[in-house]
């Protein structure tokens, strides 16, 4: 770090005038990674006069640049060419006499402060006046310039003849063109000073060439590619004062292609995943064993992601049986042609022949797209009937087997209910329990981020054998009823699950911790909870919606939480159901959520803190945190739980750097920018999701492994948001195209390799959760932790 400056992982700060800096600060090789620097603050540096072309280029992540009360006289035209993330520039009280708009034209600045510079009145600075007028906000700057007679005049009053904005005019034919054809665009520009003209074609794939004079130009695009559909082409006129552009959107029509069609995968429902390209929107038609498949609410097409002319989705089958096994053909058709692909699907064996997998029900209600032979995106209502066209050729034997299955299932179900009732009576008499303690009915689906998978003998990571989805945890997500709930095996829903009931008078609220969609969370004291302590601090989650469904969800969640017991899962103490609101009681974790904790113990927080500053997390402490989260995830996987929202915001920190998985359902409110809203209700943590979860809503233990990799990245960046520099749509594009997060500066190579092992595109290629935990444990052991971080 240069003398007179100090450097952290993300900031450079130079304010000491002695000795001061004479050149823009540069970092030593092998010190801080310049790509991670987001802020540079320079003050009192009177001998800093120039920013050269290559001074700032290494700081590609730079967002805030402040140079104040210094000697800055000249900024090279291409100084900020590589700094596309720059948002705030403050050059207050320097020695700038002129500043070209060329420095900034490619930047999306939200702030450019130029107060207190001795600008010379000329056409060169007219763009600043134009910019100020365009902003027209109440906090416009008082800018002045010196005229020929060395008089300071307000920039707002500056009048210079032959110095105005240019204009661009694009003469374009109808820009809807068929793939493979060619097109020519013409453009004319005008203005004083005479503008330059250029074409902005973005990332156009098709071959193109332009002929440009000063005021006229043409662009010829040949053999147009379907990849260019939806792209914008602009003709830009630019002079000293500013620029004008005229744009057209290119629409390319082409025949559909089915680029991806795979065997069914199971998660919370069965899904035959596909990707189709085509423009205009192709109509999709499914065939089952050669006959048209009429879609219904049980078998329907869902489009999850649309990228211009590319559609990722599923043929979703709710509760398919052996009768749905067979060949599925997808035909995509528009006026330019059609494509078809076929796959064989096996959902379940014949009754009594093989065990097959349990069917699934989705936990989130997605928008429904497309009936039979409709365009993608058509949301017309469908018949609720199960289609008959696909079963007409079945034999009577199959119908008999269906009746047999129904009868047997009914008898078994009835027996189970009787057994539960008897068990309940037996418990009451055996333990002589008083009060309302009982087995809470489990008659509806829960509403939270941890998901229970019961699939018989399947491994926790198995995605093939239709797992049963029962959601538990602490976050409210819209759900639809799961008729398979009673199919949970003894190993998952313990028959002796008794949710502890806590008397309301034993709970004394102290203060509010936050609020989620479901209700408020409070810090409270709970009396008579533990025999060894008179009272303990707890976190209390209240339920504001007292509807029947919400109450059922509440009871379901309580029962499932009672079964989750591990040192790295937040402890659930019980419920209070006397009157309203309904209350859930959890252990209180003193230091709050892990994301907040990481940020508070990062270099920036340490640098900026006043008074009693926090200490920066060491590498060994980071490893200690990581291995605890991995331990919690090993446990969840062993219990056949898929979390679906693993992130540092959903982990909590207690005394002595103890970390546990669990949140109080406030993440979607407190960390709303971490979620991407799909439709009305669903909020997806896309920055933590693997490609198959984004494209096909497929959540498995392997998708949790991917998220764990992102959590490791969060830990080693002190709580940065993954892909913080990208918008949600850009993130979706990046992840689905196979890009991964870069190695954090503080991250050892072995840990980054572990992250890369979590981010393998193919789920089955990802590291095993137990292996991840073992590796992190070994790394943490090799690097002992000193727990003074918490003071």
């Amino acid at each position: 770090c240069p003398t007179s400056c100090k450097c952290s992982a993300s900031r450079i700060w130079c304010s000491d005038p002695s000795p001061g800096i004479v050149a823009f600060p540069r970092l030593e090789p092998n010190s801080v990674d310049p790509e991670n620097i987001t802020e540079i603050f320079i003050a009192n540096q009177k001998r800093l006069e120039i920013i050269n072309e290559d001074d700032v280029e290494a700081y590609v992540g730079l967002r805030n640049l402040t140079i104040v009360d210094s000697g800055l006289k000249f900024v090279a035209h291409k100084a900020f060419l590589k700094n596309s993330n720059l948002q705030h520039i403050n050059f207050t009280r320097n020695k700038l006499t002129s500043l070209s708009r060329k420095h900034f034209r490619h930047l999306d600045l939200s702030e450019l402060i130029l107060v207190g510079n001795p600008f010379t009145c000329s056409c060169d600075i007219m763009w600043i006046k134009t910019l100020q007028e365009a902003k027209s906000s109440p906090d416009t700057q008082d800018l002045y310039c010196l005229n020929e007679s060395s008089k300071n005049i307000p920039l707002a009053n500056l009048q210079i003849p032959n110095c105005g904005l240019p204009s661009a005019n694009l003469a374009a034919p109808n820009l809807t063109v068929e793939e493979g054809k060619s097109i020519t665009l013409s453009c004319s520009v005008a203005g004083d000073p005479v503008p330059n003209m250029y074409w902005d074609v973005g990332n156009l794939v098709s071959k193109h060439m332009n002929e440009t004079s000063h005021t006229q130009g043409s662009l010829r695009i040949t053999n147009i590619s379907s990849d260019d559909s939806g792209k914008q082409i602009s003709c830009v006129a630019e002079n000293l004062v500013g620029e004008d552009q005229d744009s057209v959107n290119l629409t390319v029509h082409f025949a559909p292609t089915i680029t991806f069609l795979e065997s069914p995968t199971s998660d919370h429902h069965w899904c035959i995943p596909f990707t189709v390209k085509g423009n205009p929107k192709p109509a999709l038609q499914w065939f089952y064993n050669g006959a048209i498949l009429n879609e219904s609410k049980y078998i329907c097409t869902k489009i999850h992601v649309t990228n211009h002319t590319e559609y990722h989705g599923c043929l979703q089958l709710d509760n398919p049986t052996h009768m749905n096994n067979g060949d599925y053909t997808l035909i995509a058709k528009n006026e330019y042609g059609k494509d078809e692909k076929q796959i064989s699907a096996h959902f379940m064996g014949w009754p009594g022949i093989d065990d097959g997998a349990n069917p699934n029900y989705p936990d989130v209600i997605y928008e429904d797209y497309g009936t039979a032979a409709n365009d993608i995106g058509d949301t017309t209502n469908r018949s609720n009937e199960i289609p008959s066209t696909d079963v007409t050729d079945k034999t009577g034997r199959e119908h008999l087997s269906v009746y047999a299955v129904v009868v047997i299932a009914s008898v078994v179900g009835f027996c189970l209910l009787v057994m539960l009732f008897l068990l309940k009576l037996a418990r009451h008499s055996k333990f002589g329990m008083k009060g309302p303690a009982s087995v809470i009915s489990n008659d509806d689906d829960s509403a939270s981020p941890l998901h229970h998978i019961s699939n018989g003998s399947n491994t926790p990571s198995s995605s093939e054998g239709g797992p049963d989805a029962v959601i538990i945890g602490m976050t409210k997500i819209p759900v639809i009823e799961n008729p398979q709930y009673f199919g949970i095996t003894n190993s998952q829903l313990k028959p002796d699950t008794f949710v502890q009931h806590i008397k309301r008078h034993n709970i004394v609220l102290k203060r509010e911790l936050g609020e989620g969609a479901f209700g408020k969370v409070f810090l409270a004291e709970c009396y008579n909870l533990c025999p060894e302590q008179d009272k303990i601090l707890v976190a209390v989650k209240t339920l504001k919606d007292a509807s029947d469904n919400a109450r059922k969800d509440f009871h379901r969640e309580a029962e499932l939480l009672t079964n989750l017991q591990h040192e790295h899962i937040v402890k659930f103490y019980g419920v209070c159901v006397e009157g309203d609101p309904l209350i859930m009681v959890f252990e209180y974790m003193k230091h709050g959520d892990l994301n907040k904790f990481l940020r508070a113990h990062g270099p920036d927080a340490v640098l900026m803190a006043e008074g009693n500053p926090p200490t920066e997390l060491t590498q060994s402490q980071m490893l200690h945190i990581a291995q605890q989260i991995a331990a919690g995830m090993v446990y969840l996987a062993s219990q056949h739980f898929v979390h679906r929202d693993l992130a540092t915001r959903n982990c909590l920190v207690g005394e002595n750097l103890l970390v546990k998985i669990g949140d109080f359902g406030m993440s979607r409110d407190v960390y709303s920018t971490d979620y991407y809203r799909v439709g009305g209700h669903t909020m997806l943590p896309i920055r933590w999701m693997p490609p198959e979860s984004i494209m096909y809503r497929k959540f498995t233990t392997e998708s949790d492994v991917w998220s764990l990799g992102v959590v490791l990245w969060e830990i080693f960046t002190y709580g940065k948001q993954p892909w913080y520099q990208l918008s949600n749509n850009e993130v979706i594009e990046c992840i689905t195209q196979g890009r991964v997060l870069q190695r954090p500066r503080t991250c050892p190579q072995e840990v980054y390799e572990l992250m890369l092992g979590c981010w393998q595109r193919e789920p089955h290629m990802r590291k095993n959760i137990k292996g991840i935990h073992t590796l992190l444990q070994n790394l943490a052991k090799a690097s002992p932790v000193y727990l003074d971080i918490l003071g």
């Epitope: 003398t3 000491d16 005038p17 002695s18 006043e610 500053p613």
Partner: antibody, heavy 116, light 110 residues
Framework: QVQLVQSGAEVKKPGESLKISCKGS????????IGWVRQMPGKGLEWMGI????????RYSPSFQGQVTISADKSISTAYLQWSSLKASDTAMYYC?????????WGQGTMVTVSS | LPVLTQPPSASGTPGQRVTISCSGS????????VSWYQQLPGSAPKLLIY???QRPSGVPDRFSGSKSGTSASLAISGLQSEDEADYYC???????????FGTGTQLTVL
């Protein structure tokens, strides 16, 4: 050689004004900050403020803001420290110093005595 | 006003090694470079150490400086009688946008 020469000792009455000087030589006077430091009898050093003679930009310590004025005349390579109304508590030795890598060059000091 | 804290006095016999500490906060010593000054009786201060541990030409190598976190220290080895003086540390303070001096340490050579 590089040096800073300060004006001579002053004896003043409370309420009077005073301007003491510090002349630089042997280096580019406009390119370095000049600071002023107070040392009251038997006490430690106290930083008062700095000026950049190139553009007369100043920084004051909060304790001295509004109590003194620091100025410079670059044409004669001289920095000044002035009071509009002296108090008995202003009695002290005042040093000017050039700021480069630390305060590397010091004036010999000006003793200011304020008494009625 | 935040000042840097030094012990009021220190002493040693000729040839001995003495250390003078200087304690500050994150906004001064913790985030910026420290310089040390020697003031012989009746003289103007003189720069002894700059940028935490650098010696200007002419300063004997018996004088050395170091910094760790929000504290700095000046070490004098092979103490000599002419080292008897007041010693001050100083650093830029970001929150004040100005310099701060230490309280000063009077070194006595016994």
């Amino acid at each position: 050689q590089v040096q800073l020469v300060q004006s001579g000792a002053e004896v003043k009455k409370p309420g009077e004004s005073l301007k003491i000087s510090c002349k630089g030589s042997g280096y580019s006077f406009t390119s370095y900050w000049i600071g002023w430091v107070r040392q009251m009898p038997g006490k430690g050093l106290e930083w008062m403020g700095i000026i950049y003679p190139g553009d007369s930009d100043t920084r004051y310590s909060p304790s001295f803001q509004g109590q003194v004025t620091i100025s410079a005349d670059k044409s004669i390579s001289t920095a000044y420290l002035q009071w509009s109304s002296l108090k008995a508590s202003d009695t002290a030795m005042y040093y000017c110093a050039r700021h480069d890598y630390g305060m590397d060059v010091w004036g010999q000091g000006t003793m200011v005595t304020v008494s009625s | 006003l935040p000042v840097l804290t030094q012990p009021p006095s220190a002493s040693g016999t000729p040839g001995q090694r003495v250390t003078i500490s200087c304690s500050g906060s994150r906004s001064n010593v913790g985030g910026n470079t420290v310089s040390w000054y020697q003031q012989l009786p009746g003289s103007a201060p003189k720069l002894l150490i700059y940028t935490n541990n650098q010696r200007p030409s002419g300063v004997p190598d018996r004088f050395s400086g170091s910094k760790s976190g929000t504290s700095a220290s000046l070490a004098i080895s092979g103490l000599q009688s002419e080292d008897e003086a007041d010693y001050y540390c100083a650093a830029w303070d970001d929150s004040l946008n100005g310099y701060v001096f230490g309280t000063g340490t009077q070194l006595t050579v016994l």
